[in-house]
């Protein structure tokens, strides 16, 4: 059984553990620039002209919902976007047109590493504070595919990148989130 996506009537969607995010709609107002203007991916194939590759890490910020609850703060996730390979028919920095060789290796822009983030949820009706952990993409890369690769092989996760283990601490008061209740009530 896989982890279900974090969704609210199919509107805001954040991937659950073990799932990949779909790139958000292009006109979404919460998406901002590509990191470093579309920083070059880890690319073993023709790495000389990195400006030709467009595997980008896009930051996408939104509130998460779970049932009637909403995250206390917006969460920023990273979405892997773009083609891995020279952009077809697009001029490069010095005006030449580059073509993607049809028989060349196939690269896919996919998540490379993940992090888990604990999200505090605010719920209506004086509910006890609740939390959820979501798995978010930490970085993207171009991964080379061969005819033998299938979808499941695309989904092999990168190195563990969740926050480092902290020392155990006494937990905060269980009702600590109640102070935020008024804010939530205004949201419904």
């Amino acid at each position: 059984q896989g982890w279900q996506a974090f969704r609210n009537d199919a509107t805001e969607v954040i991937p659950g553990l073990g799932e990949y995010p779909e790139p958000p709609p292009e006109n979404n107002q919460t998406m901002n620039r590509a990191e470093n203007g579309g920083r070059p991916p880890h690319h073993p194939y023709d790495a000389k002209d990195v400006s030709e590759y467009s595997c980008r890490e896009l930051h996408y910020t939104r509130f998460l919902t779970d049932g009637p609850c909403r995250s206390a703060k917006p969460v920023t996730e990273l979405v892997c976007s773009g083609q891995c390979g020279p952009a077809r028919l697009l001029p490069n920095a010095i005006g030449r047109v580059k073509w993607w060789r049809p028989n060349g290796p196939d690269f896919r822009c996919i998540p490379d590493r993940y992090r888990a983030q604990r999200v505090q949820l605010l719920c209506p009706g004086g509910a006890a504070p609740r939390s959820r952990k979501v798995r978010l993409v930490a970085s993207c890369k171009c991964k080379r595919l061969t005819r033998f690769h299938n979808q499941s092989e695309l989904k092999d996760f990168g190195p563990e990148t969740a926050r480092p283990q902290k020392g155990r601490k006494p937990r905060p008061g269980a009702r600590g989130a109640k102070a935020n209740q008024a804010e939530l009530e205004n949201a419904y």
């Epitope: 659950g16 553990l17 073990g18 009637p68 209506p124 609740r130 939390s131 020392g167 937990r171």
Partner: antibody
Framework: QVQLVQSGAEVKKPGASVKVSCKVS????????QHWVRQAPGKGLEWMGW????????EYASKFQGRVTMTEDTSTDTAYMELSSLRSEDTAVYYC???????????WGQGTTVTVSS | DIQMTQSPSSLSASVGDRVTITCKAS??????VAWYQQKPGKAPKLLIY???TRWTGVPSRFSGSGSGTDFTLTISSLQPEDFATYYC?????????FGGGTKVEIK
Amino acid sequence: QVQLVQSGAEVKKPGASVKVSCKVSGFPIKHHFQHWVRQAPGKGLEWMGWSDPEIGDTEYASKFQGRVTMTEDTSTDTAYMELSSLRSEDTAVYYCATGDTTYKFDFWGQGTTVTVSS
Amino acid sequence: DIQMTQSPSSLSASVGDRVTITCKASQDVHTAVAWYQQKPGKAPKLLIYWASTRWTGVPSRFSGSGSGTDFTLTISSLQPEDFATYYCQQYHDYPWTFGGGTKVEIK
């Protein structure tokens, strides 16, 4: 494939402590919350508490406060539940469960029978 | 603590029957209710959460409804593998509490 494998059955005397382990595989334990639920013979389910292995945060049911301790070893992806000052009413099957929230139990271990008897 | 009262405590039904189990909370829990299925000698399995959302892999014959204090688990057409005990659970306020269970037996 998510799997939770618990330690074997235990027989304890009243006043003693028991420590049950739960080995998680299929994901890093710190990406989830760990829950413990018990079930007395022929009875219903009783939630004991949850812990967040990543930061050591815990929430215990008031009934078990002061008697229960939930810990984890993230290097081995193993959760532990220790219950002290045992009495006969603590005889039950103890289940570990895991999930991405503090409130629902997505995957469960097979259970560990703890018998408290003099 | 919030009490969750399930009814009936047991019922007999045949394969193909429509089965309805109810759960009543001692106070308003909004939609913070989950349902679990447990077979003898086995661990429970999550079926429904947020009162009506089916967990991954749960057959569509299982459905949940309700809000506030009254909740229902419905099995639209009982299958041989559905004979088990069903528990509701509230997670509106600590401590999370379960109903006493409803045992669904073969008629």
